[in-house]
């Protein structure tokens, strides 16, 4: 079998500060040096790119500086964590992955995590 | 309006050259990798190249490798075809085609046609 | 190099029938990576089915995706005027990319 299989959890709930971390694991066909992996967010039918990374194996994951997402990378596995999400935000985050170099080239694409975002209550009005 | 437009197609002589261009608008060009794929007249569709975001990695068919050069310029929102060498066999119309976020080709330009014949 | 094989080559269908298409796969293709393509002469394919069953974006509930491994289909529930044209299907799992040779679906 050709394909790449790419594993997360089914659901993960965010913290009361609106972070959210999941492992995303791919079972590498081949040595790949230069892989990318992104998290789209799937809303409906429509999919959006929430952030994206590439990196060298054994080298650390970089986002982009304004990017909502950090993550570390051990082997075939990428620790992320998204962070700044609202209520609104809950939704289906897939983790999608790409063996970019050497050839041949790969996509893995996983079956996506249910991200659970609940707003915090907002403190009431102290008397002190 | 998100679209691709091809250009360059024409008449060429075999062992000449040609380069294509595919302008894209409408979206973040350099967030998708990109294809060109051919169809010779009468047939199915060839895959040709990929290109990587950055345009770093590229990957070509086995029977244009070594002839044909894909580029990109993210700036410019552009995507490129050097095609040096060319055979008989190479004509057919070109599409630049982008990779959607989940793997297929959702976007496709009109298509330029290369001849060539002596 | 992943081989599809599309059968039949040509098929006849009278409008408001069904049509079911067939494309067989070298070696097992995971089935979020199999693709399907509807091109009418003189345009450029269109995409229709991605991951084998889901619908691109408007395209209209009677085409269908399904299977797995190295077999899947296309199904044209009921077939409207405008849907006769060539459907190629297309493994984008792995390098190099690959399309079947294509189906034409004609008037009977």
């Known amino acids: 079998c050709k394909a790449m299989h790419v594993a997360q959890p089914a659901v993960v709930l965010a913290s009361s500060r609106g972070i959210a971390s999941f492992v995303c694991e791919y079972a590498s066909p081949g040595k790949a040096t230069e892989v990318r992996v992104t998290v789209l967010r799937q809303a409906d039918s429509q999919v959006t790119e929430v952030c994206a990374a590439t990196y060298m194996m054994g080298n650390e994951l970089t986002f982009l500086d304004d990017s909502i997402c950090t993550g570390t990378s051990s082997g075939n596995q990428v620790n992320l964590t998204i962070q700044g999400l609202r209520a609104m935000d809950t939704g289906l985050y897939i983790c999608k992955v790409e063996l970019m170099y050497p050839p041949p080239y790969y996509l893995g694409i996983g079956n996506g995590t249910q991200i659970y975002v609940i707003d915090p209550e907002p403190c009431p009005d102290s008397d002190f | 309006e998100v679209q691709l437009v091809e250009s360059g197609g024409g008449l060429v002589k075999p062992g000449g050259s040609l380069r294509l261009s595919c302008a894209a608008s409408?979206?973040?060009?350099?967030?998708?990798?990109m294809h060109w794929v051919r169809q010779a007249p009468g047939k199915g569709l060839e895959w040709v190249s990929f290109?990587?975001?950055?345009?770093?990695?590229?990957y070509y068919a086995d029977s244009v490798k070594g002839r044909f050069t894909i580029s990109r310029d993210n700036a410019k929102n552009s995507l490129y075809l050097q095609m040096n060498s060319l055979r008989a066999e190479d004509t057919a119309v070109y599409y630049c085609?982008?990779?959607?976020?989940?793997?297929?080709?959702?976007?496709w330009g009109q298509g330029t046609m290369v001849t060539v014949s002596s | 190099e992943i081989v599809l094989t599309q059968s039949p080559g040509t098929l006849s269908v009278s409008p408001g029938e069904r049509a079911t298409l067939s494309c067989r796969a070298s070696?097992?293709?995971?089935?979020?990576?199999l693709a399907w393509y509807q091109q009418k002469p003189g345009q450029a394919p269109r995409l229709l089915i991605y991951g084998a069953f889901s619908r691109a974006t408007g395209i209209p509930d009677r085409f269908s995706g399904s299977g797995s491994g190295t077999d899947f289909t296309l199904t044209i529930s009921r077939l409207e005027p405008e849907d006769f044209a060539v459907y190629y299907c297309?493994?984008?799992?792995?390098?190099?990319?690959?399309f079947g040779q294509g189906t034409k679906v004609e008037i009977k």
């Open positions: 297309q493994q984008y799992g792995s390098s190099p990319w690959t």
């Open positions: 070696q097992s293709v995971g089935s979020s990576y």
């Open positions: 409408g979206f973040t060009f350099s967030s998708y990798t």
């Open positions: 085609a982008r990779t959607s976020l989940l793997g297929p080709f959702d976007l």
């Open positions: 290109i990587s975001y950055d345009g770093n990695q590229k």
